[in-house]
């Protein structure tokens, strides 16, 4: 049930994450499934156990294998699966099925290619782009963060694309790369009028004084690359631009995802060392499109 | 308003089912471990079961093997299904919310309770 | 299984008096992101028990500061400054370190 896959090639880095949820203060142990016994912690092991994270620097063919994580929550512990294949690099070009990631798909309006697990990776831009093996050249081809932006997408820019970055741990640098196939597909979409999947309308969120808060305006607004969509944060009424509290900020950039193949947008508040005055704003998370707005509004209440 | 309203108690015979629902409204429910407590008339409260996040199962011993908790997240909804019904089974049934998987801060045990359902198992 | 015990088990206490109420578990309640999980409830006659304090110490949001909780490993203490008729109750306390167990309750009444 919390089992998850995960392969990597030999002598590059692999960086597992514990199929079960956790919080930065609860610890995380990790066990070899079939002897039982305890992944250590200490960095200067090979294999090392570090909260969340298994890493592998670098991985070999032998590390193949179930491993166990538990969640240590109180009340109950969380027990998931990671299940580690790592294969031989191939002496050919070809990617064989059981390397490649997930495959994604992009139209004219949308060639976004992310790269697949980067963000379990200590790494530095910028990322080496490959397509059928051969490094990416030319103006149409842009990588920016963690993803690859390819302008005007033909129906010719499908095939099998590969990213390649260096993961750092304590100086030491290893190499990842991972594929993914890319198909070119005809838009037909369509837009609703928004709908907020959060935060509840009315929802009263507990803060405490002093720490840091987030809040999350979600909403999705129909089905393909959206014509004009967005969502954003006003206080009081106001912009959070306007409102002129450095301490509150929206996220840079809109966070989209597909969820049951709607197009769909986040935008996150971010709170920082939360005050009283704080309590007495109106939060209102706003979604809008070409056929209207809809407001849901959220109010701060103190935590004990 | 953070609120819990269950339903589905009643009276049933021994060896009977039921089916009890908790609707929740005010916060976010997926985000939330939730549980089922409950206290036998003039006794203290009893843990029953409880379901986390991600939709992993709890029972006590007294209970394992005859009920199932289960969640809805897109109604909102907490549910027990209670089979093969003992008198022992006999109480006010409490759906209670847990732990906060959104806030890394703190956990406040059951912080908030519902009114309880009424379930009598006699013949 | 966690065995959570609690004395005295009724108690009568004249308004404007101190209450104190012992609870003790059959083992630590200190986990290891280094929070103790004791919690104690009250539940007033015909209602739903409520959050009085959570993590031994901590007051819930809108608990009067005449309920105080202090403790540490396998013995906790809830102190009422001073009784005031509302209070009538049972107070349990509870731990979650591994999943719940509750208190037998603390019938608390006025004189």
């Known amino acids: 049930k919390f089992s998850k896959q995960s392969w990597g090639l030999e002598n590059e880095a692999l960086i597992v994450r514990c199929p079960r949820q956790g919080k930065p203060s609860y610890t995380v142990d990790w066990y070899y499934s079939q002897t039982n016994k305890s992944i250590p912690t200490q960095e200067r092991n090979r294999v090392f156990a570090s909260g969340q994270l298994l890493k592998f620097l670098p991985a070999e063919v032998a590390d193949s294998g179930i491993y166990t994580c538990i969640v240590r929550s109180p009340t109950f512990n969380r027990t998931g699966y990671a299940n580690v294949t790592i294969y031989k690099k191939q002496s050919d070009c070809n990617v064989p099925d059981y390397l490649m990631y997930s495959t994604v798909s992009g139209s004219e309006k949308n060639s976004k290619i992310y790269c697949p697990t980067i963000d379990l990776y200590n790494w530095t831009a910028p990322l080496e782009w490959f397509k059928n093996c051969q490094a990416l050249q030319g103006s149409r081809y842009r990588a920016h963060k963690s993803f690859l932006v390819i302008d005007n997408v033909m129906t010719e820019d499908a095939g099998d694309y590969t990213c390649k970055f260096i993961h750092n741990e304590n100086g030491a640098n290893y190499s990842v790369t991972a594929t993914r196939s890319f198909t070119v597909k005809d838009e037909q979409g369509f837009s609703l009028f928004p709908v907020i999947g959060a935060p509840a309308q009315n929802e009263i969120k507990e803060v405490e004084i002093g720490k840091n808060a987030n809040l999350t305006c979600s909403a999705c607004f129909g089905k393909g690359t959206q014509f004009l969509a967005a969502v954003l944060w006003q206080l009081n009424g106001t912009k959070i631009t306007d409102f002129g509290e450095p301490r509150i900020q929206q996220e840079e950039g809109q966070n989209q995802s597909f969820s049951n193949g709607l197009a769909c947008l986040d935008m996150v508040l971010r709170i920082a060392d939360v005050k009283e005055e704080d309590l007495l704003l109106q939060y209102d998370c706003l979604a809008l499109n070409l056929h209207g707005l809809r407001r849901h509004t959220v109010r701060l209440s103190r935590k004990n | 308003e953070v609120q819990l309203v269950e339903s589905g108690g009643g009276l049933v015979q021994p060896g009977g089912s039921l089916r009890l629902s908790c609707a929740a409204s005010?916060?976010?429910?997926?985000?939330?471990?939730m549980h089922w407590v409950r206290q036998a008339t003039g006794k203290g409260l009893e843990w029953v079961s409880s379901?986390?996040?991600?939709?992993?199962?709890y029972y006590s011993g007294s209970v394992k093997g005859r009920f199932t908790i289960s969640r809805e997240n897109a109604r909102n909804s907490l549910y027990l299904q209670m089979n093969s019904l003992r008198a022992g089974d006999t109480a006010v049934y409490y759906c209670?919310?847990?732990?906060?998987?959104?806030?890394?801060?703190?956990?406040?045990?059951?912080?908030?309770w519902g009114q309880g359902t009424t379930v009598t198992v006699s013949s | 299984n966690i065995v959570m015990t609690q004395t005295p088990l009724s108690l009568s206490v004249t308004p404007g008096q101190p209450a104190s109420i012992s609870c003790k578990s059959s083992?630590?309640?200190?986990?290891?992101?280094?929070?103790?999980?004791l919690f104690w409830y009250l539940q007033k006659p015909g209602q739903p028990p409520q959050l009085l304090i959570y993590?031994?110490?901590n007051r819930f949001s809108g608990v009067p500061d005449r309920f105080s909780g202090s403790g540490s490993g396998t013995d906790f203490t809830l102190k009422i400054s001073r009784v005031e008729a509302e209070d009538v109750g049972v107070y349990y306390c509870m731990q979650s370190l591994q999943l719940f167990t509750f208190g037998p309750g603390t019938k608390v009444e006025i004189k």
């Open positions: 005010g916060f976010t429910f997926s985000t939330f471990d």
């Open positions: 993590g031994v110490s």
């Open positions: 379901i986390d996040t991600e939709g992993d199962t």
């Open positions: 209670t919310r847990g732990e906060d998987w959104s806030d890394d801060d703190y956990y406040y045990g059951l912080d908030v």
């Open positions: 083992q630590s309640l200190l986990h290891s992101d280094g929070k103790t999980y």
